[in-house]
Interface confidence: low
């Protein structure tokens, strides 16, 4: 679909409001350190230019690609070299290399201050004074901290953010109305960012084929009544949408996502019976709803898979004729029958099937060779089932905080070279799998747990990639996307690790801990726990538990003291000495 002016085409398709929001997100995701005002100025300039192109598509520069237009605009930033260092070298390149260069400089862990939420009255005043600027700041702050956030979905979050302020700033108790909504948006936003980060990593590190395989499996579970042609069409379109968003082509991505939602709703009769409610919603809500829709019921009387994929004499012929299509059909047929399996497990089964066919179709008697291929699936299915069973039992026994601590110890022993903040963040998120998934019945536990763990372990992988410190992490992250979790699960204590020198400063605490929220206090304690394990990797669970219990009692005691700071100083020294003795440091 060739257009004389791409920028005019997207402006007309998306409308001015969405166009401006998406350009702001794109710029903030590229130049994460730039001040808000600078970005707004750039966005306004691009918007004015787009309007001239809408008026006359033949006007000067209107025929340029969006990458060229946006890249040229970003490269006008005066402080590029001093703020971003070598990223400024991108501006010497031509498209498409320049855009690739900007993408490579996206920072998953930018050095930005923590967002501190102002008082509710302050926020409501700001909202009423200038609603447009207030909402733009939200987009800007989220986008720069999450450079791979799914842009059309961020528009949906912004819409909910606006709705929360519109409703709650008029309420009798503003805080009671607003704060739970903002907490929910924050938590959902972090989860959404992490899920999208995995999609982008899948595309960028493992290629389109890996993403398509994931999509075939997931969509086949979700839409088991849809025929393979339909699932394949959706996979092709979804891959295009995510390739665009992960590549910084946010206008195209949002436009294509809207088209995909439209197609799905127009064809819901041949896709899923669960789409009716979603399809009655406005665009942003509709797209979000479709992405989260529950699995449709499986068609009755699906025949055995063995007939087409094991017993048939044509297996090798069909495989040779169109390998990826045949494997895609296998994945589709297996996934639609197994909503109880995780997507990564389904992909492991498909990989095993592919490996078997590659070997057997070259053998003297192929059928004899692959006849028992389904038997090879049994241990692959049982491994995550057993792991989830054990960990859910541990979670139910310990509760979330202590379960997180058990994982902190486990993962610090596996990969002690990883930075303490990363270990704390990742282990806390791994620990959330308990409350998120263990409540589910057996049939829903595995897809919930293992696919969530894939998202969390990807966080570890992208953070580690920025500053690699552990060969074991690199190996698990890069060898196989679908085997990341089994790879990390299989890691034992790193015997090569040289324990960290003891530093009393690491275990010195002050009265400010008393004013922290429960969550922040937990993080402080968990940070200390990781440091303890790094000092004493051979410490037993019992030793660590004793020290942590003493630590909790020390914090509680000093927070109740009249002279808190003196208590922390004096009791802290005693605690450090006692801990050193208990751990033999």
């Amino acid at each position: 679909d060739a257009h004389k002016s791409e920028v005019a085409h997207r402006f007309k398709d998306l409308g001015e409001e969405n166009f401006k929001a998406l350009v702001l997100i794109a710029f903030a995701q590229y130049l994460q350190q730039c001040p808000f005002e600078d970005h707004v100025k750039l966005v306004n300039e691009v918007t004015e230019f787009a309007k001239t192109c809408v008026a006359d598509e033949s006007a000067e520069n209107c025929d340029k690609s969006l990458h060229t237009l946006f890249g040229d605009k970003l490269c006008t930033v005066a402080t590029l070299r001093e703020t971003y260092g070598e990223m400024a070298d991108c501006c010497a390149k031509q498209e498409p290399e320049r855009n690739e260069c900007f993408l490579q400089h996206k920072d998953d862990n930018p050095n930005l201050p923590r967002l501190v939420r102002p008082e509710v009255d302050v926020m409501c005043t700001a909202f009423h004074d200038n609603e447009e600027t207030f909402l733009k700041k939200y987009l800007y702050e989220i986008a720069r901290r999450h450079p791979y956030f799914y842009a059309p979905e961020l528009l949906f979050f912004a819409k909910r953010y606006k709705a929360a302020f519109t409703e709650c700033c008029q309420a009798a108790d503003k805080a009671a109305c607003l704060l739970p909504k903002l907490d929910e948006l924050r938590d959902e936003g972090k989860a959404s960012s992490a899920k999208q980060r995995l999609k982008c990593a899948s595309l960028q590190k493992f290629g389109e084929r890996a993403f398509k395989a994931w999509a075939v499996a997931r969509l086949s579970q979700r839409f088991p009544k849809a025929e393979f042609a339909e699932v394949s069409k959706l996979v092709t379109d979804l891959t295009k949408v995510h390739t665009e968003c992960c590549h910084g082509d946010l206008l195209e991505c949002a436009d294509d996502r809207a088209d995909l939602a439209k197609y799905i709703c127009e064809n819901q009769d041949s896709i899923s019976s669960k789409l009716k409610e979603c399809c009655e919603k406005p665009l942003l809500e509709k797209s979000h709803c479709i992405a989260e829709v529950e699995n449709d019921e499986m068609p009755a009387d699906l025949p055995s898979l063995a007939a087409d994929f094991v017993e048939s004499k044509d297996v090798c012929k069909n495989y040779a004729e169109a390998k990826d299509v045949f494997l895609g059909m296998f994945l589709y047929e297996y996934a639609r029958r197994h909503p109880d399996y995780s997507v990564v497990l389904l992909l492991r089964l498909a990989k095993t099937y592919e490996t078997t066919l590659e070997k057997c179709c070259a053998a003297a008697d192929p059928h004899e060779c692959y006849a028992k291929v389904f038997d090879e699936f049994k241990p692959l299915v049982e491994e995550p089932q057993n792991l989830i069973k054990q960990n859910c039992e541990l979670f139910e026994q310990l509760g979330e905080y202590k379960f997180q601590n058990a994982l902190l110890v486990r993962y610090t022993k596996k990969v002690p070279q990883v930075s303490t903040p990363t270990l704390v963040e990742v282990s806390r998120n791994l620990g959330k799998v308990g409350s998120k998934c263990c409540k589910h019945p057996e049939a829903k536990r595995m897809p919930c747990a293992e696919d969530y763990l894939s998202v969390v372990l990807n966080q570890l992988c992208v953070l580690h990639e920025k500053t690699p410190v552990s060969d074991r992490v690199t190996k698990c992250c890069t060898e196989s996307l679908v085997n990341r979790r089994p790879c990390f699960s299989a890691l034992e204590v790193d015997e090569t690790y040289v324990p960290k020198e003891f530093n009393a400063e690491t275990f010195t605490f002050h009265a400010d801990i008393c004013t922290l929220s429960e969550k922040e206090r937990q993080i402080k304690k968990q940070t200390a726990l990781v440091e303890l394990v790094k000092h004493k990797p051979k410490a037993t669970k019992e030793q660590l538990k004793a020290v942590m219990d003493d630590f909790a009692a020390f914090v509680e005691k000093c927070c109740k003291a009249d002279d808190k700071e003196t208590c922390f100083a004096e009791e802290g020294k005693k605690l450090v000495a006692a801990s050193q003795a208990a751990l033999g440091l």
Epitope: E227, A229, K233, V325, F326, G328
Partner: nanobody, 124 residues
Amino acid sequence: EVQLVESGGGVVQPGGSLRLSCAASGGTFSTYVMGWFRQAPGKEREFVSAISQNSIHTYYADSVKGRFTISRDNSKNTVYLQMNSLRPEDTALYYCAASRFTSWYTADYEYDYWGQGTLVTVSS
């Protein structure tokens, strides 16, 4: 390697009907999206119609909607194009095509296998 053989072409008067058939061999017919394309003398090849593996979806070019019907019989490895209310501008060489990529495609470059074509002439 899939072989496609078209039949059923011929000369017909405006307003008349024809039924084209395309027999496939050498591949697993039920795994392919099947399509019909046509090429008039001195013109580019253009999409006419396509049908999904299990016949759930059918696609038509705007110029033939309501007049042409595509169908398939997987047990016979055959795809059909029923053409009614034929017009002189329908005169062309009609090709049957098979796509192993199972998304919807109206572009000829997405199809992997092609027949030799069958000639349809609409003339009084």
